[in-house]
């Protein structure tokens, strides 16, 4: 290989060992019959050398640095050449470095031809191995602007006082042009300006200077976004840290087209603007940091540009002004991430503050819109608390557990609507009365409706799940001893059509000791499946539940258990079941931890089934499934 550097070229070539490999045989640069591991070639020198091995690219790297002095004479502006040409260099991983020094008052602009650049974060690499590392200067301090790959949106970077650009090319890459030019500009009065151009839909992730380390103190950095007028842009902060400010405040400022309040100032922790039409600027302003404990300011953010959806021009009013203790969250439903570009899906408050999730609280009227290609990617979760603090006032009071129509009219699917029902301890209990009788979901008879009610204890220490219930069964009411949550969960978009079938009334009733009582009025010709709460995990220790099963005069009920034994093993106490005829009070008592479960039994009158648990040993839990079937009476036994 022969490298000749012109006399006044201000180029230095350095060939040195790269990251050491586990290759057994060392390799050397052979020059003047000397075996060396580093070779420096300066301006005006002409040198011939070889390598002592067949694959020097596995051992060596080459750095070509050109110093461009704009201090003492005119600056060589225009397209930057790769000098020496890559065809004259050994096939090693190579880094071309241009170090431009200029006066503080001079702005320098790097202009990148297509493909534009895409910034990458720490630990990331470029698919083709071609990276651009750009740094600036504040007095004597080097500031890293960022590392970039090809195929992005960054078209120009403006700096002042100097710029260092390093282009890294892998040894096998055929590229023979720098892909950028340098132009002079007037002073930009800030650290740098990065221009990002979107031709169509897409996203760009950008970072503050020195990321992930701290942004220089009291500096200003601006990003200019060029967005076609027919598209919409949204900003979201992926990661940020604030430093400890002594004077001034760290902030971001937006110049947004059409805004009457430019610049719009946001704290970094604020929701950032979205649904912006056309070009806009974003600036990051640092502060004077505390000398003792400066902390670090850093920011990584994403700009998403996409077509405005039909929905984005529609405003939806969600009136929660008459609601109390309620919150509504619109958020992305969990999905597997695909690798291709997926347009963002945002919900916007007042059409400006857009984010991937939004929580609305009661007491206000909210105007929302959507910036989303497919609203099925979002869902809604609502929580409402109904609490009674004064038992004298609440007794016999009823509340309708109904999803408000405002919410049903939103173009987003409702996932969960949870009511937290709170009562004063040991003073009141609750009764749930559905508009339509409920069916308990079991493996044997699963619910196939578009929604279900999930009923569970709302006492933090208590792990008690009563079950999942859907309209179209035999459960007339559910009484529970204390605080519960009732969640209406939807399973299909057809819930909108079936919404009329929802309807549950909760009433506060005098306190009772049992954990739960289910009132069951079976219909003829249908088999009712019932199971103990906490199925699969077992009925909690020392818990008692009852089923009040009605039998019409002309019918007989067959009670069938689906196991021979309960399977429970008690550590302390006894587990038992009582089956009691309501008319005669006659009862049968079964020891669940000892006896076999009763064979199918026939009941001509309404009866109780009561199950009470002991403290079981772990792994030997109490789970019971039984069914009730009505058949017409053939002989009148009265």
């Amino acid at each position: 290989f022969e490298i000749a550097l012109p006399r006044e070229s201000n180029i230095t070539v350095l060939i040195k060992l790269g990251t050491p490999t586990l290759l057994a045989k060392p390799c050397y640069i052979v020059i003047s019959k000397r075996h060396i591991t580093m070779l420096s070639i300066k301006s005006g020198e002409r040198i011939v050398f070889t390598f002592s091995c067949q694959s020097p690219e596995n051992h060596f790297v080459i750095e070509i640095q050109k110093n461009i002095d704009c201090m003492s004479g005119p600056c060589p502006f225009g397209e930057v050449q790769l000098q020496p040409s890559t065809s004259l260099l050994p096939t090693l991983n190579r880094t071309f470095i241009w170090d431009v020094k200029a006066h503080k008052s001079i702005g320098l602009e790097l202009q990148f031809s297509i493909p534009r650049l895409r910034q990458i974060g720490p630990g990331e690499s470029c698919p083709d191995g071609v990276t651009h590392s750009i740094s600036g200067r504040i007095d004597a301090t080097v500031v890293r602007i960022g590392t970039f790959c090809s195929n992005g949106t960054v078209s120009r970077i403006k700096m002042q006082e100097g710029v260092k650009m390093a282009l890294h090319l892998p040894w096998f890459h055929p590229r023979n042009v720098s892909g950028f030019s340098i132009a002079n500009r007037s002073s930009i009065k800030r650290l740098c300006i990065i221009e990002s151009v979107f031709e169509g839909e897409g996203s760009a992730t950008l970072m503050s200077a020195n990321y992930p380390e701290g942004f220089p103190e009291d500096e200003l950095m601006t990003w200019q976004f060029v967005v076609p007028a027919h598209l919409r842009a949204s900003v979201s902060f992926l990661n940020f840290n604030l430093s400890n400010c002594e004077r001034k405040e760290e902030r971001v400022e937006y110049y947004i087209p059409g805004s009457t309040t430019n610049p719009e100032v946001f704290k970094l922790e604020d929701k950032q603007p979205g649904n912006m039409a056309g070009n806009f600027n974003l600036s990051l302003q640092g502060c004077d940091q505390d000398a003792q404990s400066p902390g670090i300011l850093r920011l990584q953010f994403q700009v998403l540009v996409q077509h405005p959806q039909n929905e984005s021009n529609k405003i939806y009013v969600v009136d929660l002004s008459n609601e109390r203790a309620m919150s509504l969250t619109i958020e992305p439903r969990p999905v597997k991430q695909s690798r291709k570009f997926v347009p963002g899906c945002f919900v916007c408050l007042e059409s400006r503050t857009c984010s991937s999730n939004l929580t609305l609280t009661s007491g206000s009227k909210h105007k929302i819109s959507f910036l989303c290609d497919d609203l099925t990617r979002l869902w809604m979760n609502v929580e409402k608390t109904i609490s009674c603090t004064d038992h004298r006032y609440c007794q016999r009071k009823s509340y309708s557990l109904q999803v408000p129509s405002d919410i049903l009219h939103l173009p987003v699917e409702l996932h969960d609507f949870s009511w937290k029902l709170l009562v004063p301890k040991d003073r009141l209990s609750l009764v749930l009365v559905p508009a339509q009788k409920l069916q308990q979901h079991t493996h044997e008879k699963p619910c196939n409706t578009s929604f279900s009610y999930l009923v569970a204890s709302a006492i933090p220490s208590q792990d008690l799940y009563f079950g999942s219930f859907c309209p179209g069964g035999s459960i007339k009411q559910i009484q529970v001893k204390q605080n519960i949550s009732v969640t209406l969960r939807t399973f299909a978009p057809s819930f909108q059509q079936e919404a009329s079938r929802q309807g549950l009334t909760v009433s506060f009733i005098p306190y009772f000791k049992e954990e739960g009582v289910f009132t069951v009025t079976p219909d003829t010709k249908s088999k009712v499946y019932l199971r103990t709460p906490n199925w699969d995990r077992g009925l909690p220790s020392l818990t008692s539940v009852s089923w009040n099963i009605s039998v019409p005069r002309d019918q007989v009920a067959c009670l069938t258990f689906f196991k021979e034994r309960s399977g429970v093993v008690c550590q302390t106490g006894r587990a038992f079941m009582i089956i009691q005829e309501q008319r005669t009070r006659a009862e049968e008592i079964f020891s669940l931890d000892e006896d076999v479960l009763p064979k199918p039994s026939f009941h001509h009158h309404s009866f109780w089934v009561n199950i009470s648990n002991c403290s079981p040993t772990s792994g030997k839990q109490l789970d019971l499934l039984f069914s009730v079937t009505l058949t017409p009476r053939t002989v009148d036994l009265t």
Partner: antibody, heavy 119, light 112 residues
Framework: QVTLKESGPGILQSSQTLSLTCSFS??????????VSWIRQPSGKGLEWLAH???????RYNPSLKSRLTVSKGTSRNQVLLKITSVDAADTATYYC???????????WGQGTTLTVSS | DVVMTQTPLTLSVTIGQPASISCKSS???????????LIWLLQRPGQSPKRLIY???KLDSGVPDRFSGSGSGTDFTLKISRVEAEDLGVYYC?????????FGGGTKLEIK
């Protein structure tokens, strides 16, 4: 253009130390691949290579004279020095310095300096 | 040390006639980088030596193309296609592959 010029005492007494200087221009001895060799030629006889100094200060000597030779870079950037201790009549010769670079050896020679050792 | 044996000791040539000098080394001059460091020098009377050929066959700039070098391993030859008056002097071969560098004894070219 490249030039080299040797200078020395001309005459020395036996057992004295010879100090020779090679002053050069047109190249830099800090350039990778560069080197300067010393060669001598007794009158009417053949050439004998003595020592070589590389750009990175690495040195090579003729084993037959190694114990008496020292080659070094001068305080001036454009000089190479050669010292030969305990000279005797056999050291009477014309001493040349010659440049080598990464392309090849001995491409430029000085005009030579003559040394006579009297007993 | 590598011994360089040059023949003939003296060469008497008529102007315009060709001339050939042989140089043999006691071991191969092929270096690990695939190059052979064999040089031909001419020392005209009263002058310092001047390099004519390097790396066996590469002609120095300003050297007439009537000079040519050839050979490999241990056998090398310098040829002058048509001798001219300015060619007289002593020709030396020099190996710089192995330390210590060694010169051939020289071949004196005389004009008949």
């Amino acid at each position: 253009q490249v030039t080299l010029k040797e200078s020395g005492p001309g005459i020395l007494q036996s057992s004295q130390t010879l100090s020779l200087t090679c002053s050069f221009s047109g190249f830099s001895l800090s350039t990778a691949g560069m080197g300067v060799s010393w060669i001598r030629q007794p009158s009417g006889k053949g050439l004998e290579w003595l020592a070589h100094i590389y750009w990175d200060d690495d040195k090579r000597y003729n084993p037959s004279l190694k114990s008496r030779l020292t080659v070094s870079k001068g305080t001036s950037r454009n000089q190479v020095l050669l010292k030969i201790t305990s000279v005797d009549a056999a050291d009477t010769a014309t001493y040349y310095c010659a440049r080598s670079d990464s392309f090849g050896d001995f491409d430029y020679w000085g005009q030579g300096t003559t040394l006579t050792v009297s007993s | 040390d590598v011994v360089m044996t040059q023949t003939p000791l003296t060469l008497s040539v008529t102007i315009g006639q060709p001339a050939s000098i042989s140089c043999k080394s006691s071991q191969s001059l092929l270096y690990t980088n695939g190059k052979t460091y064999l040089i031909w020098l001419l020392q005209r009377p009263g002058q310092s030596p001047k390099r004519l050929i390097y790396l066996v066959s590469k002609l120095d700039s300003g050297v007439p193309d009537r000079f040519s070098g050839s050979g490999s391993g241990t056998d090398f030859t310098l040829k002058i296609s048509r001798v001219e008056a300015e060619d007289l002097g002593v020709y030396y071969c020099l190996q710089s592959t192995h330390f210590p560098y060694t010169f051939g004894g020289g071949t004196k070219l005389e004009i008949k």
